[in-house]
Amino acid sequence: ATKLTEEKYELKEGQTLDVKCDYTLEKFASSQKAWQIIRDGEMPKTLACTERPSKNSHPVQVGRIILEDYHDHGLLRVRMVNLQVEDSGLYQCVIYQPPKEPHMLFDRIRLVVTKGFSGTPGSNENSTQNVYKIPPTTTKALCPLYTSPRTVTQAPPKSTADVSTPDSEINLTNVTDIIRVPVFN
């Protein structure tokens, strides 16, 4: 069996986790991708997923999770903004490839979020303010994209998550430290 490896990220509350999961371009560019949390003794739980087929560089936001799939680079960018201590845990990017098992993109991410100074605006005169502007989307994110006769022939489809945003943009004002994972070494 393949030894599952983990990459550890230690961040403060309010910061942003910014992970890039790379994949084989030709094989998986338009496949649906998901961000999952894995807890001890439990099956992976899907927290957010891209559309089907996955659209190029089209951000999908579910709560504080933002997914962007860059087909031209073969990478899925996952951001978890305004981190909370309870976000600590083990995460993974996966690609849905029914009828086969979801394909896991190495490595798993061990996120440790601690309380303390996070460099939020106003807490330090040198701190900067990042504002993410994400265009609204009214698309429905379907996870998983395992199609069954019912999901193909009936509308609305099963298990849909409305990922539309209430305003024309999302302002994330207390994000300062963006942690980036190098993908192209």
Partner: antibody, heavy 119, light 113 residues
């Protein structure tokens, strides 16, 4: 359409084991988790555990740990739940239920299998 | 384990009237990262398996009449039947799907007054 068809009713003696089957059809079997839930006569619902038909991995409720075994046969799209060391309190209707992977709720259920444990 | 407490145990409502069932969890079932409450509601009629009505606390399952609605967040949830129909007579269960073991409320029996 999606269907989960379970095996027939069983009568067992205390201390024996029972194996209930659940045959899935109408969807890609390996793409959804399967759960087992039981319901004693006139009582509520109790979650027993989960199996991932794709890899076969399982997780059981602590209460049933050591007594329950969930397996699957991908060639027949069937999951099995075996409960050993039966006692009278295990008399119940046992259901298999398909779990949504995004949302996790149980969207399709088998018709149920009544297991009666009596001496 | 997360304990789910439903109230009332039973409820008698006139046809066309509103029925409200409450469910309280001993711990929050909200995942703040994706802002989803891992709470589902099921309907069970005698001799039948449960039927999924609502998941994520407020997302109606396809094919479920819109008189059924779910609300709430964190630890307190409500299932509302806006205008009770004869076919709604059943036992209703809430279930948390936030962590194993997935647990159900004790059920609420809805009858016609």
């Amino acid at each position: 359409q999606v269907q989960l068809v379970q095996s027939g009713a069983e009568v067992k003696k205390p201390g024996a084991s029972v194996k209930v089957s659940c045959k899935a059809s109408g969807y890609t079997f390996t793409s959804y988790y399967m759960h087992w839930v039981r319901q004693a006569p006139g009582q509520g619902l109790e979650w027993m555990g989960i199996i991932n038909p794709s890899g076969g991995s399982t997780s059981y409720a602590q209460k049933f740990q050591g007594r329950v075994t969930m397996t699957r046969d991908t060639s027949t799209s069937t999951v099995y739940m075996e409960l050993s060391s039966l006692r009278s309190e295990d008399t119940a209707v046992y259901y298999c239920a398909r779990g949504l992977i995004y949302g996790d709720a149980f969207d399709y259920w088998g018709q149920g299998t009544l297991v009666t444990v009596s001496s | 384990d997360i304990v789910m407490t439903q109230s009332p145990d039973s409820l008698a409502v006139s046809l066309g009237e509103r029925a409200t069932i409450n469910c309280k969890s001993s711990q929050s079932v909200l995942f703040s990262s994706n802002n989803k409450n891992y709470l589902a509601w099921y309907q069970q009629k005698p001799g039948q398996p449960p039927k999924l009505l609502i998941y994520w606390a407020s997302t109606r399952e396809s094919g479920v009449p819109d008189r059924f609605s779910g609300s709430g967040s964190g630890t307190d949830f409500t299932l509302t039947i806006s205008s009770l129909q004869a076919e709604d007579v059943a036992v209703y269960y809430c279930q948390q799907l936030a962590s194993y073991p997935y647990t159900f409320g004790g059920g609420t029996k809805v009858e016609i007054k």
